[in-house]
């Protein structure tokens, strides 16, 4: 595995994600065992979990992890301060939202205690490997007889994110899908009033701040269906276990909220 | 005719791995998202996996989460999933079936049978 | 998880007959409602999706009902290859998607 890292002259250095230091000698010791890789995502720049398979071991080993930022104020090695653990051994550490240098390349370092010279490093481009959380607050506004907009809010620097929007009836088989850019925001230009709708949007952190790969977990899904009626505008709605909200500033226009972001609302 | 065949399916021991493929002709495979839906001998059905039509989202049901991975090949009409860390209540007869949520076509299925 | 429960678990029937069976959702499903017909040793087959929708090339003797959280699959008038055991299954929450536990029909 090789990543590309840049270096602080903008120059990219591709160096290998692993340097194994082991013993010249002919025999396979257990300085010369491969330790597993070390897998970091951040968590909507909020934490950071950094995590092995401690599986791989050929016994029950208690890594360690280190870590610094390398060419910069912060090349200072630290110790990891919280660890992850499964089966009661380690498995990961978890870095604070101060610990957290997105443009800064993060070097993180695991050994065997018992073994010091049992050691790999990798190299890492923490804003390609940010994953924020799933949208929420999804609301539907009805702009017209035929056409919905769809809106949602990321607990994050909006501009930072793109977004997928998938959309299906209940005559589908499959989701259709529209990517939309930092806007948050999505029109259905032709709605047929005799089918029910269903909405959802995940987020990445691609590609205004970072060039992430992982999408973020689904939004709860949204619905609108096809006997929102004029005289009882709440009949679907209800039915559909969603909240019809009329609101002035809306201008009259109708705005559905999903039941989960309304009891999200409710209780803080 | 739209036919949905399915392979891979055998006898494997407890944390053990396979790779389920399913080769798609009939349709506009890539009209399609896609699933796999098992059923253990003498039970019902239970969803396990969907992809979309391009391959670019899946979702997987909670038994299955972590150990299985579907993926698809819309060059070669083909659906796989890719199936680690086997236990013996993922033993079942595997079918592939087209759409993501509504399952127009179906296979016959493959067997999968996890024992020690 | 939305759980469906089909009644009942099994049925015996004369070929003629009129039958329903029906399926009962945990939570309101809209029309999110889909039905396959499975036969011994053969893939499942879809019936009607979208609660009361004919799949293409299904006889018109088989009809669905029903929104929210109550739907019924209805057989108008028993043919003997109409004996199997049906499915319903909901998409309006997913992932998961769930099915029912299954409804045997058997002839009498």
């Known amino acids: 595995l090789n990543t590309t890292i840049l270096t602080p002259n903008g120059n990219e250095d591709t160096t290998a994600d692993f340097f194994l230091t082991t013993m010249p000698t002919d025999s396979l010791s257990v300085s010369t065992l491969p330790l597993p890789e070390v897998q970091c995502f951040v968590f909507n720049v909020e934490y950071m979990n950094c995590t092995w398979n401690s599986s791989s071991e050929p016994q029950p080993t208690n890594l360690t992890l280190h870590y610094w930022y390398k060419n910069s104020d912060n090349d200072k090695v630290q110790k990891c301060s919280h660890y992850l653990f499964s089966e009661e051994i380690t498995s990961g550490c978890q870095l604070q939202k101060k610990e957290i240098h997105l443009y800064q390349t993060f070097v993180v370092q695991l050994q065997d205690p018992r073994e010091p010279r049992r050691q790999a490093t990798q190299m890492l481009k923490l804003q390609n490997l940010v994953i924020p959380w799933a949208p929420e607050n999804l609301t539907l506004h009805k702009l017209s007889e035929s056409q919905l907009e769809l809106n949602w809010n990321n607990r994050f620097l909006n501009h930072c994110l793109e977004h997928l929007v998938q959309y299906r009836t209940d005559w589908d088989h499959s989701w259709t899908e529209q990517s939309v850019d930092y806007r948050h925001k999505f029109s259905l230009p032709s709605v047929d009033g005799q089918k029910r709708y269903t909405f959802r949007v995940r987020s990445r952190f691609n590609p205004l701040c970072g060039s992430a790969q992982h999408w973020s977990e689904w939004s709860h899904p949204i619905h609108w269906g096809s006997n929102t009626s004029k005289e009882n505008p709440f009949l679907f709605a209800l039915e559909a276990e969603q909240k019809l909200i009329s609101e002035e500033d809306l201008g009259g226009e109708q705005k559905l909220i999903s039941e989960e972001d309304l009891h999200h609302h409710h209780h803080h | 005719e739209v036919q949905l065949v399915e392979s891979g399916g055998g006898v494997v021991r407890p944390g053990g791995s396979l790779r389920l493929s399913c080769a798609a002709s009939?349709?506009?495979?890539?009209?399609?998202?896609m699933s796999w839906v098992r059923q253990a001998p003498g039970k019902g059905l239970e969803w396990i996996s969907s992809?979309?039509?391009?391959?670019?989202?899946?979702d997987y049901a909670d038994s299955v989460k972590g150990r299985f991975t579907i993926s698809r090949d819309n060059a070669k009409n083909s659906l796989f999933l890719q199936m680690s860390s086997l236990r013996a209540e993922d033993t079942a007869l595997y079918h592939c079936a087209s759409g993501e949520f509504r399952f127009d076509y179906w296979g016959q299925g493959t067997l999968v049978t996890v024992s020690s | 998880d939305i759980q469906m429960t089909q009644s009942p678990s099994s049925l015996s029937a004369s070929v003629g007959d009129r039958v329903t069976i029906t399926c009962r959702a945990s939570?309101?499903?809209?029309?999110?409602l889909n039905w396959y017909q499975q036969k011994p040793g053969k893939a499942p087959k879809l019936l009607i999706y979208a609660a009361s929708s004919l799949q293409s090339g299904v006889p018109s003797r088989f009809s669905g009902s029903g929104s929210g959280t109550d739907f019924t699959l209805t057989i108008s008038s028993l043919q003997p290859e109409d004996f199997a055991t049906y499915y319903c299954q909901q998409s309006y929450s997913t992932p998961p998607i769930t099915f029912g536990q299954g409804t045997r029909l058997e002839i009498k």
């Open positions: 009939g349709f506009t495979f890539d009209d399609y998202g």
């Open positions: 992809i979309n039509r391009n391959g670019g989202s899946a």
């Open positions: 939570q309101s499903i809209s029309s999110y």
